[in-house]
Interface confidence: medium
């Protein structure tokens, strides 16, 4: 059978390096060598390429070399295959080299803002030192910000032979880490050269974006004042523009700004202590360019009224996220704040708020909150300077087992009853809403019975038990992930009432 | 898997500093507390101390303040602990464990490193 | 802090026995009491929490008892795979400490 005719010749000029032809079929059923025959010199001159017959038999490749490799030129190729019955010949197939000439990457040698131009990057690179020092290249530039998986590319083309380049990458964000990769072909080339090394540079700074500005309200001391911590962060959805040196704060009783108090700082939160009226409070960020713009907030006095306008709540969850919404009487408040901590005790809280406009729902992503952590959610209505009575839920984004069972004792054993008393679990080894307990009991050598009971229940009297007998106990508190046995106790129910016998006594 | 890979072994002159990793598979470390065990040979089980990689928040066993540092890089699911002035006395092995609440149980402990402390 | 103090330090044993470990701590820690297994060359697992809850997966010839200061660890019917070191474990309080372990070896 003669060998199949080679089809889909395809051809690529790494320059200075090599010419290589690649067909198919890349294998034979009986063993096949070839030949690929090639005109070069626009056809004045040609030569062969044999594919070696013991180590590259059935090898659907071949590589000219130099010094037979010009350019520019035009070259035909055609590839015999031969096998033991015959030789079949391809179509004749015509290359310009200009047009399959694949080149090195270039090298970024630096990425740099230029000095008083915002939003803007200079990358500098060396053209590849193997390339046709007369043609022109074009480049494709690929960007990222340094914590984004998603690349942008920009294209463009550079004719001048000089070896360092530059390209002026504007409309990025300020004061943005950006990692930049580069590649290059000429520009009749089909061809692109690899991706040069990563290079990373960073944007211009500019003057500070807006502040969220929020208060945790503390309950009055003995001697009157009343702390006010006061917390502020980058406004929701400003862009990282610049590295904040410090804030203002400024604040004084409402009609009274010769009481005007400034504070200093470089944290994101400060404690304030006040008096009994209403307070203004302002706070600006501000760096080596500039100040943001002023956040307010108004203390309310001490004895004003808040207004109460959220009737409703819930907390469920989806496939990755918590997501809280709540219903409101008042159709003009479209402005929220929504706090959330663990509700832990024996560990400092680390409490966290985000303000929520034009909705009545709030989502975070479960990854965001642990697991078996009870998490305090409360949502303040806030009606343009006034800050309104809070809702408050709590939520689970993952229940477990509780890590202790209740601790169990028997009181008031009689004849045929017995009550049962068991402590809440502490909150830091509930791992979940508490759903109901179950009271396990069994008399010596017989059957275990259950009793499962609410989770407001911490107390149960067992009755129509055998008079006499030895019993073991043991309750399960369960969450929905499942249930923990507690502590077992043992008793025995009493012979005689205690009650019985007093009265025989008196007799 | 649910695991906590740790580096084998580490030798270390006395009077110098060691820090150990530990890092998750299978689950995030922010979600958990990381608690570092130190193990002699032939001899019990010391508790070092641990860290909340959400917040950094840590807490120490008083033997070991001041001496460990217990750090956390949640971008790449990784616990540290810093020993610093080893003696001889600290030649054991290192274990990470996860510690799911303030008080539960180490359901996955690491695979322990091996710290040697000689001239 | 609290001291956890555990007995025996060796058991030999063959196999088919009943094994008892006890712990005792210096203050009472309520139930919060955990058994681990360290077998040659591993890291501990997790065997008993809450001092009488086994943890998924445990085979129920392992069970724990107790409560406030004396706790015990039981393996029913001890086979030869349970050749390891056991150490109790109190997270009552800060620090944590651990009992010093028993060695359980099979004749």
């Known amino acids: 059978v003669l060998p199949a005719k080679p089809e889909n010749i395809s051809c690529i000029f790494y320059y200075e390096e090599n010419f290589t032809c690649t067909w198919s079929p890349e294998k034979e059923a009986s063993y096949t060598w070839y030949k690929v025959k090639r005109t070069y010199s626009y056809g004045y001159k040609s030569d062969i390429c044999s594919t070696d017959n013991s180590t590259r038999g059935n090898h659907a490749s071949c590589s000219f070399l130099p010094p037979t490799i010009t350019n520019p030129d035009n070259y035909t190729i055609q590839v015999e295959a031969q096998n033991a019955d015959g030789i079949m010949k391809s179509d004749i197939t015509y290359w310009n080299l200009d047009a399959i000439m694949k080149i090195e990457p270039p090298e970024i040698f630096s990425v740099k803002s230029v000095l008083g131009i915002k939003r803007m990057l200079q990358i500098k690179w060396i053209r590849p030192v193997l390339a046709p020092h007369s043609s022109t290249l074009k480049y494709t530039l690929r960007f990222r910000t340094i914590n984004s998986a998603y690349w942008m590319e920009v294209n463009f083309t550079k004719e001048d032979i000089d070896r360092d380049e530059t390209y002026n990458l504007t409309e990025l964000q300020a004061f943005t880490e950006y990692v930049m990769t580069l590649r290059c072909a000429p520009a009749e080339s089909m061809f692109w050269s690899g991706w040069s090394q990563e290079k990373v540079g960073t944007t211009e700074e500019e003057a500070p974006y807006g502040l969220d500005l929020w208060r945790v309200l503390k309950p009055a001391m003995v001697d009157g004042r009343r702390p006010v911590q006061l917390m502020w962060k980058k406004a929701t959805g400003a862009p990282v523009l610049e590295k904040a040196l410090g804030y203002n704060i400024w604040y004084f009783p409402e009609n009274n700004t010769n009481l005007t108090e400034t504070v200093n700082t470089t944290n994101q939160t400060h404690e304030l202590y006040l008096g009994g009226k209403t307070y203004w409070v302002y706070v600006v960020s501000y760096n080596s360019l500039g100040e943001s713009p002023v956040a307010t907030l108004r203390i309310p006095a001490l004895n004003e009224k808040t207004f109460q306008c959220i009737e409703a709540m819930q907390a469920c969850l989806t496939q990755d996220q918590l997501v809280v919404e709540w219903q409101s009487s008042a159709p003009e408040v479209d402005t929220w704040m929504v706090e959330w901590f663990p509700d832990v005790d024996s560990e400092p809280s680390s409490f966290s708020w985000e303000s929520v406009s034009q909705a009545r729902n709030w989502t975070i992503q479960k990854d965001e909150l642990k697991p078996l952590w009870c998490y305090n959610i409360s949502v303040y209505p806030v009606l343009r300077d006034r800050v309104g009575q809070p809702y408050s839920t709590q939520a689970y984004v993952q229940e477990g087992i509780p890590s202790a069972g209740p601790v169990t004792q028997a009181d008031s054993i009689g004849v045929k009853t017995v009550t049962i008393t068991w402590k809440e679990i502490p909150k830091s080894k509930r791992n979940g809403f508490i759903k109901n307990y179950t009271i396990f009991y069994q008399a010596e050598d017989g059957k275990e019975f259950s009793k499962t009971v609410n989770s407001n229940i911490l107390q149960y009297r067992l009755e129509s038990l055998t008079r006499r007998t030895s019993y073991s106990l043991q309750v399960m508190a369960s969450t929905n992930a499942g249930g923990t046995n507690g502590t077992k106790i043992n008793f025995k129910t009493l012979s005689i009432s205690h009650h019985h016998h007093h009265h025989h006594h008196h007799h | 898997e649910v695991q906590l890979q740790q580096s084998v072994a580490e030798l270390v002159r006395p009077g110098a500093s060691v820090k150990l990793s530990c890092t998750a598979s299978g689950f995030n470390i922010k979600n958990t507390f990381i608690h570092w065990v130190k193990q002699r040979p032939e001899q019990g089980l010391e508790w070092i101390g641990r860290i909340d990689p959400a917040n950094g928040n840590t807490k120490y066993a008083p033997k070991f303040q001041g001496r460990a540092t217990l750090t956390a890089d949640t971008s790449s699911n990784t616990a540290y602990l810093q020993l610093s002035s080893l003696t001889s006395e600290d030649t054991a092995i290192y274990y990470c464990?996860?510690?799911?609440?303030?008080?539960?149980?180490?359901?996955?402990w690491g695979t322990g490193t091996t710290v040697t402390v000689s001239s | 802090s609290i001291v956890m103090t555990q007995t025996p330090k060796f058991l030999l044993v063959s196999a088919g026995d009943r094994v008892t470990i006890t712990c005792k701590a210096s203050?009472?820690?309520?139930?919060?009491v955990t058994w681990y297994q360290q077998k040659p060359g591993q890291s501990p697992k997790l065997l008993i929490f809450s001092a009488s809850n086994r943890y998924t997966g445990v085979p129920d010839r392992f069970t724990g008892s107790g409560y406030g200061t004396d706790f015990t660890f039981t393996i029913s019917t001890v086979q030869a795979e349970d050749l390891a070191v056991y150490f109790c474990q109190q997270d009552y309080s800060s620090p944590w400490t651990f009992g010093g372990g028993t060695k359980l070896e099979i004749k």
């Open positions: 203050q009472s820690v309520t139930n919060d």
């Open positions: 464990a996860r510690y799911y609440y303030v008080s539960s149980y180490f359901d996955v």
